[in-house]
């Protein structure tokens, strides 16, 4: 059988083969960061020869060349230094404005290893126009210098740079330029996941049930699509499985799509997901017309069933046909619902195209996009009803022009991206949907990204400072109520001296709140069973604090979801008729349930809640504790079924000051409080002044460590009595 020669090394780089040395195999070069391969790839022809895309000679020596960033072509009303033809990785360019002009954007920009400038386009503006000066991105030339209502500006890129974004923009009545900022980039440049995730996520997170963000930060670059909670989103996932996509990369496409689906279903909107794989022909694995497209398990299962081999007979890249199948799906749904009905008109549509190259058959995909825009009646007023994200993966044959043509163009947003590899894609999908910036009281949202602060990860977590020195912890369960332990307040009732410290994005120390009202469970009496040899008894160890003011929701302050409420039901994506028992069954669904609490230093620690028959073996060791319970005859009198039990195996134990904090678990990327830290047999912080230092109990310790947490499922009557007008409770 023919095979291609193996003398294809690249100096200073490496290569991979999609199908070995056989005809049809794609050889992809890669270089260390800061360098790019030239050529990027070769294809093994049936003749047994390597073909290099767009090359004149059949086999040029592959080399790693240094990445460079484009130079400014012109900079209005100011100067830039240094003036070079192009800039090396790590090189800076600085901007200054003439008198009377104010610099907007980044005064200094650095060339990054992907051939892209960091920061934002620098603009010297005097604020004279109806729209702000749109600026000229590095490497671009602009024609048009009037910024009044209806005025247009046009852009082109110098030499061999590729334009992404809008080549033409118009100053709209609302003072905003149409489309999206044009960027001129090297053909070999690509996006870093940390840039793509927030850019993608911004545009997405509003689609997913948020109200407007409090402010526009650098991380959240743009308008957020407004879908009310009653609205509906159709999400169409298009996965390229043409020959140039390796089987492994196809698996990562699937995995990334699964992550996306998982995240999307964790939001409180109605969503239908379509899944289409495509090569020469599209294959619809799930249609939005199928009722199962609303069910996460069905959607994930149809994704899992997507086979790479489904397309082995036609291995081209027919992006037009894939987008056309979306158009046909939309058309069918429109016929079904009626073109003039609100049911049809209020659906928002998002298309995510994951591809590794440009379409090479079936005609221009732009035609299908135009049809889609037409059927959805996309105009200036209805621009928010369609978002097309074009994501190219792997730098080899991805066509920037085509991706840019397909992606939506919206002010302050990007919809076209090229990522270096599927690993980067996976990273993006992992981090793109960060709902922690939402300003409404959506519960149980924590920022899960690796660079989030402890408070952003557990924004419900609060510190309570009573009269005594001993602090306690608690959890926000609404914008004004905190749930904590009753034993924190056993030294008297003057709560005017207490303070509750709540997370605040403006201060690493948080913000202090006074307490308007404290509701301490009347059943709590630490000495209630003294005559039974039980020196301390923690039954009914639960309290509620009403803060003097409402907490402003932010990345650092947000309530946790309380089970048995409508709010938690939405977060769990459970049907409307669900009961409290259903929640208990879903959340405490194993004999050992992984859960967490928050340590004194703010970090999240792991425990396992023992359920069912394992609960008794967890709780029984209390009978060996002779200090707290010197004459104990019946352990059942100490550990009642109000308590959850942890502390076996490798569990962390809470310290004394961590009492009252939430015991919580994660489901569907949301957090639910199932208990609160009450008491235990071992204090890992004893004798340590440093809140970062915890000592594990020695293995020989008798009794071994055990920790007991008030089980919120057992406190329902009390919670309902005091929070009935704050939260919406489900039937028991």
């Amino acid at each position: 059988a023919t095979s291609c020669p193996q003398n294809v090394n690249i100096s200073g780089g490496t290569f991979t083969l999609s199908h070995g040395w056989a005809p049809g195999s794609l050889l992809i070069y890669s270089c260390p960061q800061g360098l790019y391969p030239s050529p990027a790839s070769r294809l093994c022809k049936s003749s047994g020869q390597w073909q290099t895309p767009r090359a004149t000679r059949s086999l040029t020596k592959a080399v790693c060349k240094p990445v460079r960033c484009p130079a400014p072509v012109s900079f209005e009303n100011g100067i830039y230094t240094p003036r070079l033809g192009s800039y090396p990785v790590g090189g800076n360019v600085s901007f200054e404005c003439e008198d009377g002009f104010i610099l907007r954007g980044s005064p200094v920009r650095q060339c990054r290893p992907n051939g892209m400038w960091d920061g934002e386009t620098a603009v010297c503006d005097n604020g004279a126009g109806h729209c702000p000066n749109p600026g000229i991105s590095l490497g671009a030339v602009r024609t048009g210098s009037r910024f009044g209502h209806g005025d247009k500006v046009r852009y082109r890129c110098s030499s061999n740079l590729v334009l992404t974004g809008s080549a033409e923009r118009e100053c709209q009545g609302n003072g905003v330029w149409s489309g999206t900022e044009p960027i001129c980039r090297q053909p070999y440049s690509y996006d870093f996941p940390e840039d793509v995730a927030p850019a993608l996520g911004t545009s997405f997170s509003h689609m997913l049930g948020a109200t407007n963000p409090t402010q526009r930060t650098k991380e959240s670059l743009g308008r957020k699509i407004q879908i009310q909670r009653s609205g509906h989103l159709n999400l169409y996932l298009l996965l390229d499985s043409s020959q140039s996509v390796s089987e492994n990369d196809f698996l990562i496409f699937k995995e990334s799509a699964s992550l996306m689906v998982d995240r999307i279903f964790s939001f409180e909107i109605n969503v239908s997901v379509a899944i289409i794989t495509f090569a020469s022909e599209p294959k619809v694995l799930m249609s939005v017309l199928n009722v199962n497209s609303r069910d996460i398990t069905e959607v994930i299962s149809s994704l899992e069933n997507a086979k790479y081999k489904d397309h082995e007979n036609g291995t081209g890249t027919n992006t037009y046909a894939a987008l056309n199948s979306v158009y046909l799906m939309m058309n069918n749904q429109m016929q079904l619902l009626g073109m003039k009905t609100m049911a049809w008109q209020e659906i928002r549509h998002a298309i995510i195209l994951l591809t590794d190259g440009k379409s090479n058959m079936g005609g221009s995909p732009k035609t299908a996009v135009d049809q889609i825009r037409e059927i959805l009646n996309i105009n200036q007023k209805r621009n928010d009803y369609l978002d097309i994200y074009a994501i190219g993966v792997g730098k080899l044959d991805v066509d920037w022009r085509e991706l840019n043509e397909l992606g939506s163009k919206k002010d302050g947003e990007r919809h076209a991206f090229i990522l270096q590899d599927t690993k980067a894609l996976h990273q993006v999908f992992e981090h793109m949907l960060d709902v922690s910036k939402l300003t409404d009281t959506i519960c149980g949202v924590g920022n899960m990204s690796a660079n989030a602060s402890d408070q952003e990860r557990t924004p419900w977590h609060v510190t309570i400072k009573p009269k005594s020195q001993e602090t306690c912890r608690g959890a926000l369960i609404s914008d004004q109520w905190v749930l904590t332990a009753a034993h924190c307040f056993r030294d008297g009732n003057d709560h005017s001296l207490w303070r509750v410290n709540v997370g605040d994005p403006k201060s690493q120390w948080g913000k202090e709140f006074l307490i308007e009202k404290a509701v301490i469970s009347p059943g709590f009496d630490v000495f209630a069973k003294k005559n039974q040899g039980i020196l301390e008894f923690y039954g009914d160890d639960i309290a509620l604090l009403k803060l003097a003011q409402k907490v402003k929701m932010s990345t650092h302050a947000r309530p946790i979801c309380l089970p048995c409420t409508m709010e938690a039901n939405l977060a769990l994506r459970r049907p409307q008729g669900s009961t409290c028992r259903d929640h208990e069954n879903e959340l405490l669904n194993k004999q050992s349930v992984p859960a967490h609490f928050v340590a004194l230093n703010g970090s999240k620690l792991n425990i396992n809640l023992k359920m069912g028959v394992e609960w008794t073996s967890c709780a029984e060791v209390v009978s060996q504790e002779k200090t707290m319970f010197p004459n104990l005859t019946d352990v059942r009198e100490v550990v009642t079924d109000q308590f959850l039990c942890s502390g076996t195996q490798e569990d962390e134990s809470p310290c004394k000051g961590e009492s009252g904090g939430a015991v919580f678990l994660e489901r569907r990327f949301r957090f639910f409080q199932v208990g609160l830290v009450s008491w235990g047999l071992y204090n890992p912080c004893l004798g340590s002044a440093d809140k970062n230092s915890r000592k594990r109990a020695p293995r020989s310790k008798v009794p071994p460590p055990r920790d007991f947490h008030i089980n919120l499922f057992r406190m329902q009557p009390w919670l309902r009595q005091h929070l009935g007008d704050v939260l919406n409770f489900l039937p028991l």
Partner: antibody, heavy 122, light 108 residues
Framework: QLQLQESGPGLVKTSETLSLTCTVS??????????WGWIRQPPGKGLEWIGS???????YNNPSLKSRVTIFIDTSKNQFSLKLSSVTAADTAVYYC??????????????WGQGTLVTVSS | SSELTQDPAVSVALGQTVRITCQGD??????ASWYQQKPGQAPVLVGY???NRPSGIPDRFSGSTSGNAASLTITGSQAEDEADYYC???????????FGGGTKLTVL
């Protein structure tokens, strides 16, 4: 409301294997921490626990029957089953399936099937 | 030994209070649960834990525990309470379940 329904042959020959299946409706067999149990009652006598299974796979059997009892679960069908081998006339009884709950220091069966009579004859 | 002992039969006058008892070493460690069974029917849970009653069970049924004994008390017995009553708990090892022999309650 949870419902349990036993099914299987009403007549089994001595030394053969008795096989019964319990179908659970109105709830998932894998949700929560429940112990799906079999209990039997010989005619005119008291209740005897045969064994229980947890959806995680753990089984708990009556030591007096242990070597003869197999209980297994089929989560896809929302069913659990009992196999009792080498049966004798003493195994003639009404066989009940039930949902067992271990909560705190107590264990109880809160939902029961209506029972099925199995007669062992030679 | 891992067994639960019940009186085989108890009778009570209509409207009076009756106590059905269950004894066994395992009751020092675990609470009993109680079932009512009428002829030809499946058992029905009437009490469990320290003193818990499932929803739908009249409040004339109550449970208690002391030492190695558990009791089910019916205050103001009704004719429909005539049935067999079984107690049940985990055995002393905690690994298995045991039932009492049953008590036949007659309402006179």
């Amino acid at each position: 409301q949870l419902q349990l329904q036993e099914s299987g042959p009403g007549l089994v020959k001595t030394s053969e294997t008795l096989s019964l299946t319990c179908t659970v409706s109105g709830g998932s067999i894998t949700s929560g921490v429940y112990y799906w149990g079999w209990i039997r009652q010989p005619p005119g006598k008291g209740l005897e626990w045969i064994g229980s299974i947890y959806h995680g796979g753990n089984t708990y059997n009556n030591p007096s029957l242990k070597s003869r009892v197999t209980i297994f679960i089929d989560t896809s069908k929302n069913q659990f089953s009992l196999k009792l081998s080498s049966v004798t006339a003493a195994d003639t009884a009404v066989y009940y399936c039930a949902e067992g709950v271990s909560s705190g220091w107590s264990y109880y069966f809160d939902y029961w099937g209506q029972g099925t009579l199995v007669t062992v004859s030679s | 030994s891992s067994e639960l002992t019940q009186d085989p039969a108890v009778s009570v006058a209509l409207g009076q209070t009756v106590r059905i008892t269950c004894q066994g070493d395992s009751l020092r460690r675990f609470y009993a649960s109680w079932y009512q069974q009428k002829p030809g029917q499946a058992p029905v849970l009437v009490g469990y834990g320290k003193n818990n009653r499932p929803s739908g069970i009249p409040d004339r049924f109550s449970g208690s525990t002391s030492g190695n004994a558990a009791s089910l008390t019916i205050t103001g017995s009704q004719a429909e309470d005539e049935a067999d009553y079984y107690c049940n708990s985990r055995d002393s090892s905690g690994d298995h379940l045991i039932f009492g022999g049953g008590t036949k309650l007659t309402v006179l």
